[in-house]
């Protein structure tokens, strides 16, 4: 599998409609929780929780502050922590507790605390519960949590130093935690947790499971340096701990290695960054998407692997265990365990078979089973990705978060659309197209290029958004910017499953937001733009320039995958000649204008889509070069003497026949650099005039012209 290509389109922050929320002097907007039924997005930040309108996040509905007392700050600072940054209250847990309350935990100046937030009054109840084991002490430490039936399952560190990792369940009747032992958790960096419900009609009466994803230091591989390993672990919701062995500890904690590698090149992605569990009506078993980077990531590599949950379940239910053996100098080595496995199976959830054997609860499990799972929490079998390869590998980018949406294209094909954020504040939207990856677009969410810390996807039909949280605020973006594709070709070439061309309205529309039937809409995920109706009209601009000047003709082609070239009187221009230059890889510069330069200039783009080449006429300009006699009297029109060598620009209406382009002979260089001739004349542009004072009085007029063209593909 090759590296993913560059995004086809790059949307700058100001180019697209993004809604933003931020409060001055509030930072670290890293906890997001969406209540779809209330159309409310809850935002946990440093020292504050906000409720905003999920359809327009700039509308704040409620706010509550949870600040650290000066006394607590001082005590924290005495322990060597920063009073200005670390000794504050970073909200780290924001989970639904009931229809009217949220469970909120914060680092609270290295004294983690939890409270209940009443959603009616939007005030904390003042419970001030000890947050140890539920929330990290240090805002820099990793954490994850999920609320399951009113009980909080967390993965975090249990002490001030962050040296004691813990996966726990906060429960009034049955609190549980992991053993503090290297085989269980070895310096983990927690990434994600979620509950997977067993289907009610499950024949084996199985339990719900809570999955944890993290990266930890390997125990099974020995190298000179610490090898990091991505893990999937799971516990059973019904676990009540053991009676004697593993008392108040998990009896169902098992973990396995997640594989995400490129077999052909030996590229191994072993640092887990984020996980998204995709649930969809069409999926019998959830699929989870995991985002990785390699341990030694000096080139900025990122990968996404997708896994069937059933693969993980198979490893935990039937896989082999690993065992530690002591070799010389009391050195521990981990190997596959091939001995007898006690019954009931260690780490298994209590199912119908166990109940039939009178093991109705983990408290009834025999010591042999419990001792075995205590000593063998690690599986020998690994969890492998779908198709045994990554869905996406991208170079020169550090991805931070992922969300995935399953959507249906017009032809009925189902696509998993991956929204992946970067450490530079951008969002990539990618799909798999016939074993290749197509990055539809890149959107700059945060203008300061700051890392995206959290991503959230709304699942409500009709109004679909991605929410991204960073240090400075939250941004709301639609799933697609269909309306930004101005032509049928652009709409089709985008190969965006959310977008289709509507011939009646001549607009690119969002499929999920169109109420009208999809009949007549055009969408070709193959990128075959020949399905587009012929353009009967193509507007062009007419410019008048003075002799000896320089003209700049604009060509706005958004596609990063397209190659731009220019034609003059149907002949392809050589941009590297002394006569012509390219500005910004697309705009044409014509130097030292003479009457021979008058005529029709066309900017064409060539884009390879699969094995086809799609040609488009992006812009057409008619240039007329005139010799302007020097005025006898002093000019009185000095106010318009600001257009360099341009005399006038007209946008006119006419009818001309284009011709299909030959194979282009010249293209814009990737650097976009051009060599200007010595002392070039002032430049005139076709769209925005350059401000250059000139001695020749100039008049300005505009008119619109349309072309019938057959060369628009």
């Amino acid at each position: 599998m090759a590296f993913a290509p560059i995004p086809r389109i790059t949307w700058e922050h100001r180019e697209v409609h993004l809604v933003q929320f931020h409060e001055p002097d509030i930072y670290n907007y890293s906890a997001l929780l969406l209540s779809e039924d209330k159309d409310t997005l809850y935002i946990g930040a440093r020292e504050a929780v906000f409720a905003v309108n999920a359809l327009n996040i700039s509308e704040k509905q409620h706010e509550v502050y949870w600040k650290v007392s000066e006394d607590k700050k001082a005590k924290c600072a005495e322990k060597g922590k920063s009073k200005q940054t670390e000794c504050l209250n970073y909200i780290r847990v924001l989970q639904p507790l009931s229809a009217t309350s949220l469970y909120v935990c914060g680092t609270n100046a290295f004294q983690p605390a939890c409270d209940h937030l009443n959603l009616t009054s939007f005030k904390f109840l003042g419970k001030n519960e000890d947050g140890k084991g539920r929330c990290p002490f240090d805002p820099a430490h990793s954490y994850t949590s999920v609320m399951v039936d009113g009980e909080l399952y967390s993965g975090t560190s249990y002490n001030f130093l962050g040296s004691e990792p813990i996966i726990s369940r906060n429960s009034s009747h049955s609190p549980l935690r992991t053993e503090y032992a290297i085989p269980w958790l070895n310096e983990p960096s927690f990434v994600f947790a979620d509950v997977i419900r067993k289907s009610p009609d499950s024949p084996d009466g199985e339990d719900d499971r809570v999955y944890f994803f993290f990266t930890e230091v390997s125990v099974e591989y020995e190298f000179v340096f610490r090898v990091l390993i991505p893990r999937i672990a799971r516990v059973c919701k019904g676990d009540q701990g053991g009676l004697r062995t593993l008392q108040k500890k998990w009896t169902s904690f098992l973990k396995a290695r997640l594989i995400c590698s490129r077999p052909d090149s030996g590229l191994v992605f072993n640092v887990l960054r984020d996980v998204f569990v995709l649930r969809s009506p069409g999926l019998k078993v959830p699929v989870f998407y995991a985002l990785f980077t390699p341990q030694l990531n000096n080139v900025g590599l990122s990968a996404v692997c997708a896994y069937n949950l059933s693969t993980a379940e198979e490893v935990f239910s039937h896989g082999k265990y690993m065992q530690s053996t002591t070799v010389e100098q009391s050195h521990t080595k981990w190997v596959r365990y091939n001995g007898p496995v006690p019954k009931p199976r260690p780490g298994a959830c209590i199912d119908s078979e166990a109940r039939a054997a009178n093991y109705t609860s983990s408290l009834n499990l025999p010591d042999k089973t419990l001792q075995f799972v205590k000593d063998h929490p690690l599986m020998d079998d690994s969890v492998t990705p779908i198709d045994n390869r990554p869905r996406l590998i991208k170079k020169d980018v550090n991805y931070t978060q992922i969300v995935v949406d399953r959507t249906q294209a017009l032809d009925g094909t189902v696509y998993d659309v991956m929204f992946v954020s970067t450490d530079r504040g951008a969002l990539h939207k990618a799909i798999s197209l016939e074993h290749a990856v197509h990055i539809i677009e890149e959107t700059q969410l945060f203008q300061d290029f700051e890392p995206v810390q959290t991503l959230l996807l709304s699942s409500k039909k009709g109004n679909r958004f991605v929410y991204a949280g960073s240090n400075s605020g939250v941004v709301q973006a639609p799933l697609a910017f269909c309306g930004k594709h101005g032509t049928c070709e652009d709409c089709v070439l985008a190969r965006d499953p959310y977008c289709a061309w509507s011939p009646p309205t001549a607009t690119c529309v969002a499929l999920h937001q169109t109420e009208s039937p999809s009949r007549g809409l055009i969408q070709e995920m193959s990128g075959d733009a020949s399905v587009c109706p012929d353009k009967s009209k193509g507007s062009y601009r007419q410019h008048f320039f003075k002799h000896g000047g320089t003209a700049e003709l604009k060509c706005s082609q958004k596609s990063n995958l397209a190659r731009v070239f220019w034609k003059f009187q149907n002949g392809v221009l050589k941009a590297e000649s002394p006569k012509y230059g390219l500005m910004g890889r697309k705009n044409l510069l014509i130097f030292n204008l003479s009457e021979g330069d008058s005529g029709v200039y066309q900017c064409l783009s060539e884009e390879r889509v699969k094995n086809k080449t799609v040609f488009q006429v992006v812009a057409k300009h008619v240039l007329e070069v005139k010799v302007v006699p020097k005025p006898v009297v002093a000019p009185t029109l000095s106010v318009v003497q600001t257009e360099g060598s341009r005399i006038a620009t007209k946008v006119l209406v006419a009818s001309t026949q284009g011709s299909s382009p030959p194979t282009p002979a010249v293209q814009a260089t990737s650097s976009g650099a051009i060599t200007l001739p010595p002392k070039p004349a002032p430049t005139g542009t076709s769209c925005e005039p350059k401000i250059v004072i000139n001695t020749v009085p100039q008049l300005h007029s505009e008119k619109t012209m349309y072309l019938k063209s057959s060369d628009n593909r």
């Epitope: 409060e23 020292e47 502050y65 600040k67 200005q84 300061d448 400075s472």
Partner: antibody, heavy 118, light 106 residues
Framework: EVQLQQSGPELVKPGASVKISCKAS????????MHWVKQSHGNILDWIGY????????TYNQRFKGKATLTVDKSSSTAYMELRSLTSEDSAVYYC???????????WGQGTTLTVSS | QIVLTQSPAIMSASPGEKVTITCSAT?????MHWFQQKPGTSPKLWIY???NLASGVPARFSGSGSGTSYSLTISRMEAEDAATYYC?????????FGGGTKLEIK
């Protein structure tokens, strides 16, 4: 100790512009928003806007858009407010105030008196 | 924008007397903040987030309220408390201040 030192009093003619400075010390200048407040002669306090020194992004009270422009110089930890097209209505004391999470102005400058008179 | 109305505009109190200044908002606000200003000086943050006393503020001061009605209370008036007190909301932009209450000592 946190300090905000504002520039001295200004006497300017109507129609002119003026730039008031606020030099910050004793804290991380780029890490906190800087707010500006106008106190006119009836002692009425009016919030003008804020700027985030980290990226220079500013937000204004609609009433002061076009009147005030907020800028910062990170190298000297100084915030500036330029007021243009001055009229007698702009005569007031102008304060800069360091932001804090959840409230404005845990520290205020000493104020700059602006008098617009012909 | 939210308008804050303070009452009374001017009041005087004897030493040891209990003083209450109220601030009424035209819309619901989450929190109210209070500033103290003495003649010739800049405003000082006095009470933040409705009920938290700023650093150095005597314990005889307290703040309370919710929704559209908030108050600042001095349990026992002292001479040094004579000043103008302003309420401020920042829940809805733009932030707004009350017209001020001038508190004098009898």
């Amino acid at each position: 100790e946190v300090q905000l030192q504002q520039s001295g009093p200004e006497l300017v003619k109507p129609g002119a512009s003026v730039k008031i400075s606020c030099k910050a010390s004793g804290y991380s200048f780029t890490g906190y928003y800087m707010h500006w407040v106008k106190q006119s002669h009836g002692n009425i306090l009016d919030w003008i806007g804020y700027i985030y020194p980290y990226n220079g992004v500013s937000t204004y009270n609609q009433r002061f858009k076009g009147k005030a422009t907020l800028t910062v110089d990170k190298s000297s930890s100084t915030a500036y407010m330029e007021l243009r097209s001055l009229t007698s209505e702009d005569s007031a004391v102008y304060y800069c105030a360091k932001g804090a999470s959840g409230y404005d102005g845990d520290y205020w400058g000493q104020g700059t008196t602006l008098t617009v008179s012909s | 924008q939210i308008v804050l109305t303070q009452s009374p505009a001017i009041m005087s109190a004897s030493p040891g007397e209990k003083v209450t200044i109220t601030c009424s908002a035209t819309s619901v606000v989450s929190y109210m903040h209070w500033f103290q200003q003495k003649p010739g000086t800049s405003p000082k943050l006095w009470i933040y987030l409705t009920s938290n006393l700023a650093s150095g503020v005597p314990a005889r001061f307290s703040g309370s309220g919710s929704g559209t009605s908030y108050s600042l209370t001095i349990s026992r008036m002292e001479a040094e408390d004579a000043a103008t007190y302003y309420c401020q909301q920042r829940s809805s932009y733009p932030p707004t201040f009350g017209g001020g209450t001038k508190l004098e000592i009898k």
